[in-house]
């Protein structure tokens, strides 16, 4: 008779592959199998009990032969029902069945807790066929058991669309307590009560808990897991852990630090990212948060001019992204800037103050009181104005830009003149007679060209007209002035 032995790395319903060095004996007795793998497991449970067939696992296939011979009932032999062992030990267990060859096509598989075992499990199936019966022993071994190996294992054989199921083999892995919930680090308010939780499981049960604060036990008597420790309040940082004890020994949880919330440290490294005439973009590095998240920050801005009244502008912003654009500042001005941030406990001190300056900008207003009149004798237009207020020049005046537009009979022509900063009058040549001249003036700094004044119009008559009068910037709300001479 043939003896087949095989090992499978992955247990499939069909028995994959031969076990290295197939057994060459004609027929090895069913219950005295050699360990084909060559290693002696820590625990070996063989189906040595003779095992009456038990009806729960018996399959009596419905199909009969062409001669109507019923197929005999099949059942797995009884084996050990419960295995208790320590974590990291090895275990080997098996199920066995003798299948008459007349069944001709069977598959076998291992299942754990209702799920087929298809992973990298170490299963060995050995076949011992003779003329009438094939003895099958399916062994399952775990070299170093873990808690996750706990459960109910069964063999299933599929034969003629029937399923035969072995008795379950319960594996119970015992070891040191295993934490399912450990205390967590916390940040707490000074002198305020808080809770810590610790939970551990066996087997074996029960599991008892001791609490430890700064290396000293808190409770004299152990508490059954799970345990909640109520701490009435702390005035300084402390480290807590818990010890879980069972019959196998003790396991210590991680130590967790309980911090006391405090006001934050002041921000550091306040720096200028960008300056314009009227805004400054700053950034800062937040200080230590005092074990409580930052809520918002305050930017304090003082004019650095010793002659200023020393008032402080305050701008509030969110704590993130450690960046703020300070607006509504004066051009060409110096400022001192500090930052302070707050958490639920309170405000930090102000950061070290830094100096920052705004740049020169274009004037924000146009020249005032623009007047225009015709000097007919010299065929010129005279323009006069007043410079914008110093505060609104936003820089050092470098001059003025004069726009004069000449319109006559549907033709329009714009000319631009530049005037030095000292003047407050200009003279432009008449470009076209019998035309309207529209004049606008803008102040200019290195920061740019400011807004143009409202237009002032003057009519330039044909040669020979005598009378003339000046035109000037209208009072607000009046229509554009046009003087006909």
């Amino acid at each position: 008779a043939i003896t087949e032995a095989r090992e499978e790395a992955k247990p499939y319903p069909l028995f994959p592959g031969p076990f290295p060095g197939s057994l060459q004996t004609d027929h090895t007795p069913l219950l005295s199998l050699p360990h084909a793998s060559g290693y002696q497991p820590a625990l070996m449970f063989s189906p040595t009990q003779p095992g009456r067939p038990h009806t729960g696992n018996v399959a009596i296939p419905q199909v009969t032969s062409v001669e109507s011979k019923p197929l005999p009932p099949l059942a797995f032999k009884h084996t050990v029902g419960h295995i208790i062992l320590s974590e990291h030990k090895g275990v080997k267990f098996n199920c066995s069945i003798s299948v008459p060859n007349i069944y001709q096509d069977t598959t076998i598989s291992w299942w754990k807790d209702g799920k087929e075992l298809l992973g990298a499990h170490h299963a060995i199936t050995q076949f011992y066929p003779d003329d009438e019966v094939t003895a099958i022993i399916a062994s399952f071994s775990i070299t170093s058991v873990q808690r996750s190996d706990n459960g109910s294992y069964i063999c299933k054989m599929k034969i003629n669309n029937e399923e035969i199921v072995s008795d379950p083999i319960y594996i119970e892995v015992q070891g040191l307590p295993h934490f399912t919930k450990q205390p967590e680090s916390m940040n707490v308010t000074r002198n305020t009560a808080f809770n810590l939780t610790c939970q551990a499981v066996g087997p074996p049960e029960p599991v008892n808990i001791f609490w430890v604060q700064n290396s000293s036990r808190v409770n004299e008597q152990p508490e059954k897991s799970p345990s909640v420790l109520t701490v009435p309040g702390l005035t300084e940082m402390a480290v807590f852990s818990c010890e879980a004890h069972n019959d196998k020994g003790l396991t210590v949880s991680k130590g967790v630090q309980i911090n006391i919330k405090a006001i934050p440290s002041p921000p550091t490294e306040v720096s200028i990212r960008n300056s314009t005439a009227h805004s400054i973009l700053i950034s800062w590095v937040p200080g230590f948060d005092g074990y409580s998240p930052f809520r918002n920050c305050s930017i304090q801005v003082k004019e650095a001019d010793p002659l200023s009244n020393g008032s402080v502008m305050i701008f509030n912003t969110s704590a993130l992204p450690h960046l703020y654009q300070i607006k509504q500042l004066q051009a060409l001005a110096n400022y001192s800037i500090g930052v302070s941030c707050m958490n639920e406990i309170g405000w930090s001190a102000v950061s070290p103050w830094i100096l920052a300056s705004t740049t020169e900008g274009a004037p924000s207003v146009a020249p005032l009181n623009v007047t225009v009149f015709l000097n007919e004798s010299s065929d010129n237009v005279d323009i006069r104005w007043m410079k914008p207020p110093t505060k609104q020049q936003d820089g050092e005046l470098v001059g003025y830009r004069i726009s004069h537009v000449w319109q006559s009979a549907g033709i329009s022509k714009e000319l631009l003149e530049e005037v030095g900063q000292n003047g407050s009058r200009a003279r432009i040549s008449v470009q076209v007679h019998n035309a309207t001249c529209t004049v606008r003036i803008a102040a200019v700094t290195r920061g740019g060209v400011g807004p143009f004044s409202d237009p002032v119009k003057i009519f330039i008559p044909a040669h020979g007209w005598v009378d003339y009068a000046p035109s000037s910037t209208p009072a607000p709300g009046n229509a554009d002035p046009v003087l006909i001479i």
């Epitope: 087949e4 499939y12 994959p16 062409v66 011979k69 060859n101 007349i102 066929p129 094939t134």
Partner: antibody, heavy 120, light 107 residues
């Protein structure tokens, strides 16, 4: 010794049927399933199905369902395979092959093959 | 259905050479793979089953390996009688399927 002896070559017309026999000897016929495998000229092997020689229950490959019938005569330890509605692409050598063991689906003993020619 | 893809389809080698034929399954078949040898005009002969167990009487120059989806048949030192066509077959599940064959020819 264990052997499978098949019937002789057949020449059939398209649309006809062919029945190939396979006589087993040297072992208990009803303990081993019988498979049928064919091989077209110059081609590979194609599994057609198998029959449980104890129960007489056949299992057919989808490509042959409705055209093939596998039967037994246990008194003479003979298995039969009948293929109907023959087409030119059924021209092949047909083998019977013994299923090795109750837990294995490979073939340890083969018949010598029966050549079936389909020609009008 | 599980497809079995053999490579190469043709292989030229000399007596004494070591040759390897591979077979790839379209899905995991464990080690439920067998190899056959077929000579012209003859029925196939079983060489290897369970991916690596030699059938009775098969010379030890034939060896098989692999599991899951990748399998190989190795002939360590070719003999004149080894020139033939070789087929793999999976028997993880029905329908049983074969590779398309590798024809081993004398160089």
């Amino acid at each position: 010794q264990v052997q499978l002896v098949q019937s002789g070559a057949e020449v059939k017309k398209p649309g006809a049927s062919v029945k190939v026999s396979c006589k087993a000897s040297g072992y208990t016929f009803t303990n081993y399933g019988m498979n049928w495998v064919r091989q077209a000229p110059g081609q590979g092997l194609e599994w057609m199905g198998w029959i449980n020689t104890y129960t007489g229950e056949p299992t057919y490959a989808d490509d042959f369902k409705g055209r093939v019938t596998m039967t037994l005569d246990t008194s003479t330890s003979t298995a039969y395979m009948e293929l109907r509605s023959l087409r030119s692409d059924d021209m092949a050598v047909y083998y019977c092959a013994r299923k090795s063991t109750v837990v294995s689906r490979y073939f340890d003993v083969w018949g010598q093959g029966t050549t079936v020619t389909v020609s009008s | 259905d599980i497809q079995m893809t053999q490579s190469p389809s043709f292989l030229s080698a000399s007596v004494g050479d070591r040759v390897t034929i591979t077979c790839k399954a379209s899905q995991d078949v464990g080690d439920a793979v067998t190899w056959y040898q077929q000579k012209p005009g003859k029925a196939p002969k079983l060489l290897i089953y369970w991916a690596s167990t030699r059938h009775t009487g098969v010379p030890d120059r034939f060896s098989g390996s692999g599991s899951g989806t990748d399998f190989t048949l190795t002939i360590s030192s070719l003999q004149p009688e080894d020139f033939a066509t070789y087929y793999c077959q999976q028997y993880r599940s029905y329908p049983l399927t074969f590779g398309q064959g590798t024809k081993l020819e004398i160089k």
